[in-house]
Amino acid sequence: QAGPLPKPTLWAEPGSVISWGNSVTIWCQGTLEAREYRLDKEESPAPWDRQNPLEPKNKARFSIPSMTEDYAGRYRCYYRSPVGWSQPSDPLELVMTGAYSKPTLSALPSPLVTSGKSVTLLCQSRSPMDTFLLIKERAAHPLLHLRSEHGAQQHQAEFPMSPVTSVHGGTYRCFSSHGFSHYLLSHPSDPLELIVSGSLEDPRPSPTRSVSTAAGPEDQPLMPTGSVPHSGLRRHWE
């Protein structure tokens, strides 16, 4: 008796973080024996969608012509072969930005910081939110989450960095979100350029949890060493 069918591969183009109204294509790649592909979305009636395979039958395309809240969420796909259904793919999380107005990102005391000193990035939203995310451009795993305890709503989140090194320099943006859907984010804040000056090159901080075994300098997560802010927010690494 043959073992279970290998699980398909699921991905999104141009990516898995999509602005409201933009198009996105979800691809599911199985085997040449596939007769049908099925896409399921977590917490939604199944099947979410079904497609016939594209020649040579090893993948299927699921098109979203205009991204809306309905499409944000966690997906898995399957394929059916003559011997039955495959294992589910690894999940794909499709995130929509533009669900809420953009927050403001600032640096305290200044976006120009001397190496070895401290800086705090402050993300502020006009309306109370319970999740804030800090994103660094060109980082492979750029998300740093602050989520409020017990669903308490906050107008801001602090991301302290200390001691600052040259690795912390770069362009940052932040997003805000409500806990009822982690897949719906605000518009991005305007970018903030953090400039680290100083001739003394500090040793790079050792992350307590590395994100990638083959991580380069831009792939490290932000590792603020200050205490978690007193705003009732809790830090989550993505």
Partner: nanobody, 121 residues
Framework: EVQLVESGGGLVQPGGSLRLSCAAS????????MGWYRQAPGKQRELVAA???????KIGDSVKGRFTISRDNAKNSVYLQMNSLRAEDTAVYYC???????????????WGQGTQVTVSS
Amino acid sequence: EVQLVESGGGLVQPGGSLRLSCAASESIFSSNVMGWYRQAPGKQRELVAAVGINRLTKIGDSVKGRFTISRDNAKNSVYLQMNSLRAEDTAVYYCAAGAYVRFLQQSPDYWGQGTQVTVSS
């Protein structure tokens, strides 16, 4: 060949209840989300409720707390239980089947002929 057959419509007083049934062919029922739309005269068709093969449901905002949907795999049938009916629930109710994304796009793959529900005293 008729693949979705509705029954259970009729005239009911405000505050009353009705149960709509939809029988489907096994091939359609076993692989699709089943659901109900309604269309009142001069109004747009709206999704009332849907239920997946995983038994997860979606209930339209206008009927939440009053209508429930269920499916019976042994009978290849889906049911819409309508309680606390109001005059504004008067419409032709259509059974539909397809992938859920088609329900969101108001274009399921299969449709029934419809059954009239009239709520009036």
